[in-house]
Interface confidence: low
């Protein structure tokens, strides 16, 4: 039932899926609205059909529609009477069409929907004037999307009369200016998304009832909330991926729980100025609104001091230029549970009473320039709630002796890429001078530890005694195990993931024996010097094994390969100098499709390098000659 152009006519109803009161006709090349669906249909989805025009009476057969979706229907025109009988319609999706073409007619059509709650007009090349006309008189709307249009300026006429609106999505437009009062009529507005626009600053933010504000991916250099004592209900503020120079000036009274500041140009600058005359370091903003001019003065290094951060739970300050945290900064956030300072310029961190706050569960200080952590003397319970601590990629040589002793709940610790050494015996907590080693012993809660690329010397005795490690990464510490797994014996029965990549491990005299690692699921031995296959005990839990980039010349004996293939899901074997005459008995692994990189496994045959997949079954003919030679 296709017409000559290949589009289905409205008579072909077999193309729609009907479930209860919902009709799903998406992507069926329909040129018009089907007319013979059940009249009680409450939900009609016509996405991705080339309708072009929604005619008067198209929807007349369905007087009970509550939800209509016309996403990506090439709509250029909606006739004035298209929604005339649709008194029950609550949700209308018109995203990704061409409604700017006949916007006045479309606006007239929409005005017949006084009960509409949700309207999606995204991706229609609408300007602010077009949008204003379309939204006129739709006072029942709760949720509006104008994302992906060509809106540039907002004033109080655009959203006039939408006093019940709760959710407004304006992301991916070209908004560079928002006039004062543009949102004043939206007393119910709770979610506002302005991401991916061109806003240069927000210097008089006063939407006290807003709950979520997303202004990420703009060109903001300033964010200032209105001064004064108004109570703000803001819970989530996303200012990430902007060009902020200073910590945002937040409300004096707020319920802010999540503050996202990732990827800006922020720092604290007090140290750059003469602290005896701090009053000189201020900025003044001239706010011109009609014929009223206000001047706002802001102190640029105490920008956080008047902000209400008491409810803050999640703070992301990663990818900025913070060189230090001012005294009292973290003390203002007693409820903080997640703090991300990844990729800044921090050189030292002072740990004091309530700084970081006791509620902190995740702290990421990775990719900074930390050379020292300072622990205030006599602190009994600092970091007591901390579960995840990332110190990766800094310049630490050690940590203060009491630091981990007090952090009784840490489960995940990443100290990779710091030039640390492990303390030979339990470190004395009264040691003088900067910390020169790290002791993980008796960190009972510790389950995951990464020490990759730490330049560790040979491991001392029982370095992980008293921990609960299930994940351990010792990769890129050359010679640290000295061919023996003995330093891991305390944690061997618990370990599930063990990474021993690039460690110079060799097995010239004796195969590495993992018999005591009964729970090991994932073992990475890549980039070592192993010449023989590692040995595993009887009850093998291993699921993934990586042996790439070693010196293996023979594949494992048939017995071993069959044992491995029973539990093993994935094994990596490429980039080893196998002898093609030693591949016999690999059938079990090969047929079980366990070898993830089987297509890249090569072997040497008569000084040629051959892909194993190209070898015929059994032992190659050339090997029989080689074996005969050996027997002579």
């Amino acid at each position: 039932w296709r017409n000559r152009s290949g589009t289905a006519t409205a008579a072909s109803q077999g193309v729609c899926k009907l479930v209860g009161g919902a009709a799903d006709c998406r992507g069926q090349s329909l040129a018009s609205v089907p007319s013979s669906l059940p009249p009680h249909a409450r939900m009609l989805t016509l996405d991705a059909n080339p309708l072009k025009t929604l005619w008067n009476h198209s929807l007349q057969p369905y007087p009970l529609l509550e939800s209509l979706s016309l996403h990506s229907c090439h709509l250029e025109r909606i006739s004035r009477g298209a929604f005339q009988e649709q008194g029950h319609l609550r949700s209308l999706v018109l995203g990704d069409n061409c409604l700017s073409e006949n916007y006045e007619e479309t606006a007239a059509a929409l005005h017949a929907l006084p009960g509409l709650r949700r309207l999606d007009l995204s991706g229609n090349a609408l300007t602010e004037d077009m949008a204003a006309l379309m939204l006129q008189n739709l006072s029942s709307l709760r949720s509006v999307s104008l994302a992906g249009n060509t809106i540039m300026r907002l004033d109080d006429s655009v959203f006039e009369g939408l006093e019940r609106l709760r959710e407004l999505d304006l992301q991916r437009n070209y908004i560079f200016e928002i006039e004062g009062g543009a949102f004043d009529g939206l007393a119910e507005l709770r979610h506002l998304n302005l991401a991916f626009n061109n806003l240069p600053c927000i210097v008089d933010f006063g939407l006290t009832r807003l709950r979520v504000l997303n202004v990420s991916y703009n060109v903001l250099e300033w964010f200032l909330a209105t001064g004064g004592e108004a109570a703000f209900e803001l819970e989530t503020l996303d200012l990430s991926h902007n060009q902020l120079l200073f910590f945002p000036l937040l409300p004096q009274y707020s319920k802010l729980r999540t503050l996202l500041l990732r990827d800006n140009n922020m720092g604290f600058y007090r140290d750059l100025y003469n602290t005896s005359s701090p009053r000189e370091m201020v900025a003044q903003f001239l706010l011109v609104d009609g014929n009223v001019t206000n001047i706002t003065t802001v102190s640029l290094w105490e920008e956080f001091s008047s902000s209400d951060l008491a409810d803050l739970r999640f703070l992301d300050m990663s990818q900025n230029q913070f060189q230090y945290l001012p005294d009292g900064f973290l003390r203002k956030m007693p409820s903080l549970s997640h703090l991300n300072l990844h990729q800044n310029c921090l050189m030292t961190l002072h740990i004091r009473e309530h700084e970081p706050p006791g509620a902190l569960t995740e702290l990421d200080l990775s990719h900074n320039q930390l050379s020292e952590l300072h622990l205030a003397p006599g602190l009994a319970s600092c970091l007591g709630s901390l579960r995840l601590f990332n110190l990766s990629s800094n310049q630490l040589l050690g940590v203060p002796p009491g630091l981990f002793a007090n952090a009784r709940n840490i489960t995940t610790l990443d100290m990779s890429h710091n030039q640390i050494s492990l303390c030979p015996l339990p470190a004395a907590s009264d040691r003088v001078g900067p910390p020169s080693c790290v002791d993980f012993r008796n960190m009972a809660s510790l389950r995951s530890l990464s020490l990759e690329g730490c330049g560790l010397g040979a491991l001392p005795d029982c370095p992980f005694q008293g921990t609960s490690l299930t994940y351990l990464d010792l990769s890129s510490n050359w010679g640290v195990l000295n061919g023996s797994l003995a330093p891991l014996q305390d944690v061997a029965p618990m370990l599930q993931v063990l990474s021993l990549r690039n460690m110079g491990l060799h097995s010239s005299f004796m195969a590495l024996d993992f018999s005591g690692f009964g729970n090991l699921r994932d073992l990475d031995l890549s980039g070592n010097c192993l010449t023989t296959f590692p040995r595993f005990g009887g009850s093998l839990a291993l699921e993934t094994l990586d042996l790439r980039r070693n010196s293996l010349t023979a594949l494992p004996q048939k017995a071993v390969s069959e044992q491995l293939s029973r539990g093993l899901r994935t094994i990596y074997l490429s980039q080893n100098p196998y002898d093609c005459c030693g591949v016999d008995g690999w059938g079990a692994l090969q047929h079980g499709q366990t070898v993830a990189d089987w297509a890249m496994v090569t072997c040497n045959l008569s000084s040629k390098i051959i892909r194993v997949t190209e070898l015929p079954g059994g032992v190659p003919r050339d090997c029989k000659w080689e074996r005969l030679d050996l027997g002579l």
Epitope: R166, R209, A230, A231, Y253
Partner: antibody
Amino acid sequence: EVQLQQSGPELVKPGASVKISCKASGYSFTGYFMNWVKQSHGKSLEWIGRINPYNGDTFYNQKFKGKATLTVDKSSSTAHMELLSLTSEDSAVYYCGRGGYDYDFDYWGQGTTLTVSS
Amino acid sequence: DIVMTQAAFSNPVTLGTSASISCRSSKSLLQSYGITYLYWYLQKPGQSPQLLIYQMSNLASGVPDRFSSSGSGTDFTLRISRVEAEDVGVYYCAQNLELPFTFGSGTKLEIK
């Protein structure tokens, strides 16, 4: 401490009007809506409407349009509700309640009892 | 308007045991961004109502954690894990998804 102090009980004649007040303290008066609720004897709660003290905007339950008028006096942090053309049906306890963002009616006044009787 | 429906009385409960109170809305109170605009209030004899639960499952400040609430978009349950004498009163559910805000008729908690 947040407090909403309502005016005392009222006894009025049918056809008259009455103005009930609700004085707020302990928080920023203009930062929250003020709601009004009716509770007839032994009955449930009915939302009358609310006012935004910041700009005086009002929202009424259709049922109470023409019956109730909501106003505020910012200088004294006081909300008022005037009830017009009273009948015995209007006899009830009237509560004011603060409207927070997360929730409405996080704090209530102690209630004002209105009796309409000849 | 959204209609909130409650039973007038709960099953009588013994002190120290748990109690459940139900509420149904005529329309889903669950919004696309995951918040359910359902509230529970308790009115003790001779007192103003007090907020117990906001947005279906969040405990208001000062409310003991014996109280909890769960539900779908339209059917909700308030649970009291260990009923105490001071829990006696009328429990109202309410919605503030749409104006006008509407309350249930209230459920009286009865002690055996």
